[in-house]
Each structure stands twice: as C-alpha cells, then as structure tokens.
Interface confidence: low
C-alpha cells in the first residue's frame, strides 16, 4: 500500500547510486574485453529510465527492457552457476573457476549487485529515504522487477549441465519463494537443459548428514523432474577444502571427498 | 582544471630504449583509463596503447607488441610508455590522453606532446 | 583492423559557408543501435581536441555550428557556419574493434 510522502518500509536508494552504477559499468567493460563497446552513458540513461517518475509499486520487466537489450550478453551456456542464500562463496568459487559464471558475474548482475534504488512517481527525483519492501510494501518494486527480469533471462539461457549452490545451514536448503526457486527453477529450458546439479554448501565443521536427503531438496528434485530435466545432488561438506581444491586440484588431499 | 604533461621524449638510436612519462593533475587519475597516441611528422593519428584504471587491461597496436610497454602509477598519477627495440618508423609526437569516462577507447583530454626522433 | 577512409584531403570554403567532411569506415562501426564513430579537431602545433562522441553527440563546450551524423559505415561532420577559428586538420575515430583506428585527416582551409 502506498504510503503518505513514499515513507516506506525498505532502505532508501543506496548513497551515489548513479556515480556507483556508472563508475561499475566503465570497469567492467575495461575487464571484459568482449563488453568494450558498451556505452556507460546510454547503460545508465537506460537504468535510469526504468524507474525515474515512475511509482515504485508499478514497475514492470518491460520497464527495464531498454536496459537488457544494452546489457545483452553472451555467457558460456554450459557453465553457467546459479546460487540461492549463499551468495558469497558462489562469488568466490566463479573468481577461482574464472570459466563459470553467476548472474553477478554478468554487466547488468555486477552493476546491481549489492544497490537498492527506486524513484518517486510523477517526479525526476531519486528516492534516498527509503523504497518499497518486497513483503512488507509491493512486489513490482524497481530492484525485485529487475532481478526477476534477469534471473529470468539468466536462466533461459542455460544449458547442458547447470549448476546451483544452495545453503545447507538454512531451514529451508530450497526455498520455493527465493529468487531461484521461484523463477530460475521454472525458467530452464528443458530442449536446453539436460541436468541440474546441486551443490549443497554445509556449514558445520562436524556436519556429516547428506543433505541430499533434505525434504526441501526432494522437492527441488520433484519440480525438476517434472520438467523433463535430470537432477542431481552432491554434499559439499567442507566449503573452504573445496574452494581450495578448485584452486589446487593436483593437491593429494582433492581425492577425497570434500 | 585538467592537465597532461608528458615528457621523456628525445634522440634515438635504431634499436635503442626510451621511457615516456605523462604526468597528470586537475582529476582522479585512477577513476580514468588512459592511452597513448602517436603522430608522425606531417601525418595521421595511431593509437597505441590502453591501460584500464588497475592495470588489468591493457591492449596495443599490433605493431608496438612486444616491444612497448605500457603502465601506471595511481599514487604519483602517473603514466608510461617503455619503448625499446626502437626503429626509424617509432619517430612521432607522443600523446597521452585520458579515456571518456563513460566508453572505452576515446579521448576527452590530451597532452601537448612529446617528441621521439629514432636516427642513426 | 577497421580503414576509415576520409574525404576530401582536404577542403577550401568560405567564411559563413558550410563545410562537410566524410569519413567511411570499411566494415561498421555500429553495435546495439551505437555508432562508435567520433571526430577530433587538430590545430598546427596543438593536440586533437574531441568535437563529436558517438556519431552526433556534440562534446561539452563545443560550439553548435558543429554536428555529426551516420550510421554504419557512413559518416559526417559538418561546420555551418565556418568560422576562422576553424581552421584546422580534422580526424574521424572508430572505437568498435581493436585496434581503435583513425581516418586519415582532412584539411580545413579558408577560401
């Protein structure tokens, strides 16, 4: 429900949230050879332009469609690592294995990682103070529309074998709601994708169970399955062997199982 | 105010080394990637080299790999151009320049120039 | 490597009349509805000085009796009014594929 003066219930516009999206931009197409010819300045007049005058409960995928057309890239179908609730280490594992990549490793993932923004309707104004909250205000806010619209285009490109990280210390290990199981899930392409594998992260030292077993992770099996695509499971029992191991896979203690 | 100055330019032998200098003020010299631009007397403008704002990226001319390089220094805002194996056809005006701020690859400010003479 | 072919060499035209240089890139230039063409003024004994970023975007400061256009493989500047000042060498620049390429310069000169 709107509220009197746009006070809402999530956090306001991250601080230099232009400067930040802009300065991000001119980065990442230096250190991403095949992005060199995209254009900050119209990156970010499109950015802008999906959410400045607009009500910040209205906002649609279309809004942002001027923006996915700049950020259109193509990322190795095939090694694609998706993640849900264990962003960082997600991050860690694609800065060591620099041939697979998260969504965040894309331009338009990378710009948005991390911001929050939203504008006020009918007015050119930047909303500082606060935006909305995806429960607690609306749904089609700008920064949940927008990692909808590229989750969604992330997913859709897959294929072959794709990979998701999922937080084994969470109650829920899949959660229907998040980002991944609410859209990636449904937008693999089963003529595309053969197999989803899960990685499931454990977060006890002394954790032995296999959480493959999770209730939460045979429901992730089912609604993959259902789609005609194959799932498989695999317990990562120390996350810090592992990232080690994919740094140093000729180390004589990879053998065994991490 | 912006300002580039270079400096290091001189008198070569074939085959010799020289180190070009660009100093830079008036901006934060480590938000901008730069380049550097050459001349030949009477004619055209050739790039040469990019470096991105951490050194991560860099990219030459084909003609100058190998034998030129380029690099950085963000704490004295500094930019260089080591060039050896020098030939007769290196003899040019030097420019640094700063890239656009917002797309790779040109140049919104420019140095006046250093002179490099390759002569036996 | 991207040739940028300008003409003419060079030009002669008369104080308030209009000048236009071409600049044909041999493959384009163009990405995402972009044109990564750019075009630079060079005085005697002075450095390159940028008029016109992608195509038709004037640069800061610079005055609106120039403006660039094209697409693809086809551009040009134009002076309208010349003025003295605009006595110079001008250059297209290509930034779509390395290496970045600039055309061979066109002499601007008063009639």
């Known amino acids: 429900v709107p509220r009197w003066r746009q006070q809402w219930s999530g956090p306001g516009t991250t601080k230099r949230f232009p400067e930040t999206v802009l300065a991000r931009c001119v980065k990442y197409t230096e250190i991403h050879p095949e992005m060199r010819h995209v254009d900050c300045q119209s990156v970010w007049d499109a950015f802008k332009g999906a959410f400045i005058s607009k009500h910040p409960c209205n906002i649609t995928e279309e809004d942002y469609q001027p923006l996915m057309k700049l950020g259109t890239q193509t990322v190795p179908c095939n090694k694609i690592l998706l993640w849900s609730r264990i962003k960082d280490l997600a991050h860690q594992f694609t800065q060591v294995q620099r041939d697979m990549f998260t969504l965040e490793d894309t331009l338009l993932g990378y710009l948005a990682d991390d911001l929050t923004w939203c504008g006020e309707f009918n007015t050119s104004k930047i909303n500082y103070q606060s935006c909305p909250d995806w429960r607690k205000d609306c749904s089609n806010n700008p920064v949940s529309v927008f990692w909808k619209t590229v989750s969604r285009r992330f997913a859709e490109a897959a294929c072959d074998v794709v990979h998701v990280m999922l937080n084994g210390s969470r109650s829920k290990i899949f959660d229907k709601n998040s980002t991944f199981g609410s859209v990636e899930v449904h937008n693999l392409q089963p003529e595309k994708v053969q197999t989803l594998e899960a990685w499931v992260i454990h977060g006890g030292r002394e954790d032995s169970r296999d959480l493959c077993q999770d209730p939460t992770i045979k429901e992730l099996e089912s609604i993959i399955s259902k789609r005609n695509i194959q799932f498989s499971c695999k317990n990562i029992y120390r996350p810090d062997k592992f990232l080690q191991c994919v740094k140093n896979p000729e180390d004589s203690s990879c053998t065994s199982e991490i | 105010e912006v300002q580039l100055v270079e400096s290091g330019g001189g008198l070569v032998k074939p085959g010799g080394s020289l180190k070009l200098s660009c100093v830079a003020s008036?901006?934060?010299?480590?938000?901008?990637?730069m380049h550097w631009v050459r001349q030949a007397p009477e004619k055209g403008l050739e790039w040469i080299a990019f470096?991105?704002?951490?050194?991560?990226?860099?990219y030459y001319v084909d003609k100058v790999k190998g034998r030129f390089t380029i690099s950085r220094d963000n704490a004295k805002n500094t930019l260089f151009l080591q060039m050896t194996s020098l030939r007769s056809e290196d003899t040019a005006m030097y420019y640094c320049?700063?890239?656009?701020?917002?797309?790779?690859?040109?140049?919104?400010?420019w140095g006046q120039g250093t002179t490099l003479t390759v002569s036996s | 490597d991207i040739v940028l072919t300008q003409s003419p060499a060079s030009l002669a035209v008369s104080l308030g009349q209009r000048a236009t240089v071409s600049c044909r890139a041999s493959?384009?230039?163009?990405?995402?509805?972009?044109?990564?063409m750019h075009w630079y003024q060079q005085k005697p004994g002075q450095p390159p000085k940028l008029l016109i970023y992608?195509?038709?975007n004037l640069e800061s400061g610079i005055p609106a009796r120039f403006s660039g256009s094209g697409s693809r493989t086809d551009f040009t500047l134009t002076i309208n009014p010349v003025e003295t000042d605009d006595v110079a060498t001008y250059y297209c620049?290509?930034?779509?594929?390395?290496?970045?390429?600039f055309g061979g310069g066109t002499k601007l000169e008063l009639k």
């Open positions: 320049a700063r890239n656009y701020v917002s797309s790779y690859g040109y140049f919104d400010y």
């Open positions: 470096i991105s704002t951490g050194s991560s990226n860099i």
């Open positions: 493959e384009s230039v163009d990405n995402y509805g972009i044109s990564f």
């Open positions: 992608r195509a038709s």
């Open positions: 008036g901006f934060t010299f480590s938000d901008y990637g």
């Open positions: 620049q290509q930034t779509n594929k390395d290496p970045l390429t």
